[in-house]
């Protein structure tokens, strides 16, 4: 049986059940290569409390549909006289990066995971030439996830003192320049994730090969190498390589630019101080507030919730967007869709789409940007579920009793962007990270 998601096959992936202190290793096309789980385990569970290993999915006993992968085992789960077997179930949804498998829950018999990934899309519009896993768990099983830094188009410029060259990078995947008509970036060779531009020439100095690694709790490393043979004439016979070290800052701060810290014989070392390198619980919340010792800040957007069936309205030229954030109030136009953001076509108000649901909510504060994300909306033709990204700005003089109002700024591939100036986005900092 052919592998259902070939782009996910090259790696062993990790997921964590934080509540029970369990680490899962997942290899969807082969086995995870952990002796304690046996030679054919596709999903290996490591219980760190009891220091035991169990195979909860066998690569030989795999069944697949376009959106669901199940790994059975021969192990009985002894559930009141039934002959059920322990199994793992991975639900796949379309995403814009390779993404990460997320542990959902475990019953007595079944271990459930969800994975938003380009591999599950109906169209190839989000697929990279080359992409590697972009997250890692530290020794305390805390997740560090650089997926939000991945650019689907364009690149980051590395701060370098050399006026004659420009070094462009992407994170965990190659640079897509197709949407850029006229800049230097357009000359970058396909597949490169680190592109060096000198004058009118562009050179591939690194492609992603291995996934993100953790070297210390707050330092993550990504390595790019130039795959193809044939040395560049300015590299003194060496093969180019790029090492990017992502550093979680010791306290809250604005984002910084990736900086070139060393360069020798086409070996480039880059340091990037960014809060995205910190563990995810430091940056994100599933509620509308971020506060406490863990996050070093106090943010509470719950006063923006609308009561009594009213919504914020944002004009999007062809569409009207109805928003009801930080609550579970149904938007009247989007009845029974559980939408936090509802898109209604002006010319035909029967055309209504959920552009993100209120129970699929993430509040993120990272590198000085405060963002509320609603995902899991109605599907687009690519298979991607509509989502909304609301970028908040602090404005102490915002109208509407300080609440302000969301402004639609654009749409890209079924992701809807808004900005919202409000006094409730004014962040209060603590200093004890």
């Amino acid at each position: 049986q052919a592998a259902p998601f070939p782009e996910l096959c090259s790696y062993t992936w990790e997921a964590v059940d934080t509540k029970n202190n369990v680490l899962y290793k997942i290899n969807i096309c082969g086995s995870v290569d952990i002796v304690q789980c046996g030679p054919s385990s596709a999903v290996c569970m490591h219980d760190l409390k009891t220091r035991t290993y169990h195979s909860v999915g066998d690569s030989v006993l795999r069944s697949a549909t376009r959106s669901l992968l199940e790994f059975n085992t021969t192990v009985s789960c002894d559930q009141q006289g039934t002959n059920h077997r322990v199994q793992s179930s991975i639900a796949f949804l379309c995403g814009k990066t390779l993404g990460t498998p997320e542990f959902v829950t475990a019953t007595f018999c079944v271990h459930y995971f969800e994975w938003r990934t380009t591999a599950a899309c109906k169209k190839d519009i989000f697929k990279a030439n080359k992409e590697v896993p972009c997250y890692v768990f530290d020794e305390e099983l805390r997740k560090h996830d650089l997926n939000p830094l991945i650019k689907l188009s364009g690149a980051y410029l590395v701060d370098d003192s050399d006026p004659d060259t420009s070094l462009f990078i992407n994170v965990c995947r190659d640079i897509d320049t197709l949407r850029d008509p006229g800049s230097q970036l357009r000359a970058c060779p396909p597949g490169t994730a680190a592109c060096l531009v000198r004058g009118h020439q562009a050179f591939d100095v690194g492609q992603p090969r291995d996934g993100l690694k953790v070297v210390r709790k707050d330092r993550l490393v990504l390595s790019y190498v130039r795959e193809e043979a044939g040395k560049l004439d300015f590299c003194d016979g060496h093969s180019p390589a790029v090492t990017i070290t992502f550093v979680c800052p010791s306290e809250r701060r604005e984002g910084t630019i990736p900086k070139l810290t060393a360069k020798s014989n086409c070996r480039y070392e880059i340091e990037w101080i960014t809060e995205y390198a910190c563990h995810r619980d430091y940056l994100e919340s599933k509620t509308c507030s971020l506060s406490g010792e863990q996050q070093d800040v106090s943010i509470d957007l719950t006063p923006l919730a609308q009561s009594g069936g009213s919504s914020y309205i944002s004009d999007g030229k062809e569409y009207l967007f109805y928003l009801n954030v930080c609550g579970e109030t149904e938007i009247q136009f989007c009845n029974k869709k559980q939408a936090a953001v509802c898109q209604v076509k002006k010319s035909d108000t029967s055309q209504v789409k959920a552009a993100g649901r209120y129970h699929n909510q993430t509040l993120r504060y990272s590198d000085g940007d405060l963002t509320l994300i609603y995902f899991g909306g109605d599907e687009c033709s690519s298979g991607f579920q509509r989502m909304s990204v609301i970028n908040f700005e602090c404005n102490k003089t915002a109208g509407n009793d300080g609440k302000g109002t969301p402004v639609f700024t654009g749409e890209v591939d079924c992701t809807y962007f808004f900005t919202w100036d409000t006094e409730y986005a004014c962040v209060h900092h603590h200093h004890h990270h």
Partner: nanobody, 123 residues
């Protein structure tokens, strides 16, 4: 692709003010960085100011810091450059540009350009 149209240039006395506008159309959200550049006669094109579309993060050339302010109106897909305390050396053609490169002020990293609007500071 992105189309950019500047307006608001003109003749102004030293110490005066002008507000330049740049209207963007096309798939504007695929660009992350919006910049104003200027080119005086016989000189290279130089960076003036930049802003990111998704947030209010800005950067300025040292020569205009404290005098010029870049801003944007997302609802109108428009970028502005408010120029105060103008000096004769600010005389130039001002260009609006868009880039898919983050953290750049280099004009060669900007792939989409407007046609420019002339600002003349003279008494």
């Amino acid at each position: 692709d992105v189309q950019l149209v500047e307006s608001g240039g003109g003749l102004v006395q030293p110490g005066g003010s002008l507000r330049l506008s740049c209207a963007a159309s096309g798939r504007t959200f695929n660009t992350y960085n919006w910049g104003w550049f200027r080119q005086a006669p016989g000189k290279e094109r130089e960076f003036v100011a930049a802003i990111r579309w998704s947030s209010s993060k800005t950067s300025y050339a040292d020569s205009v810091k404290g005098r010029f302010t870049i801003s944007r109106d997302n609802a109108k897909n428009t970028i502005y450059l408010q120029m105060n305390s103008l000096r004769p050396e600010d005389t130039a053609v001002y260009y609006c540009a868009a880039s898919i490169v983050d953290f750049t002020t280099n004009p060669s990293h900007f792939g989409s350009w407007g046609q420019g609007t002339l600002v003349t500071v003279s008494s």
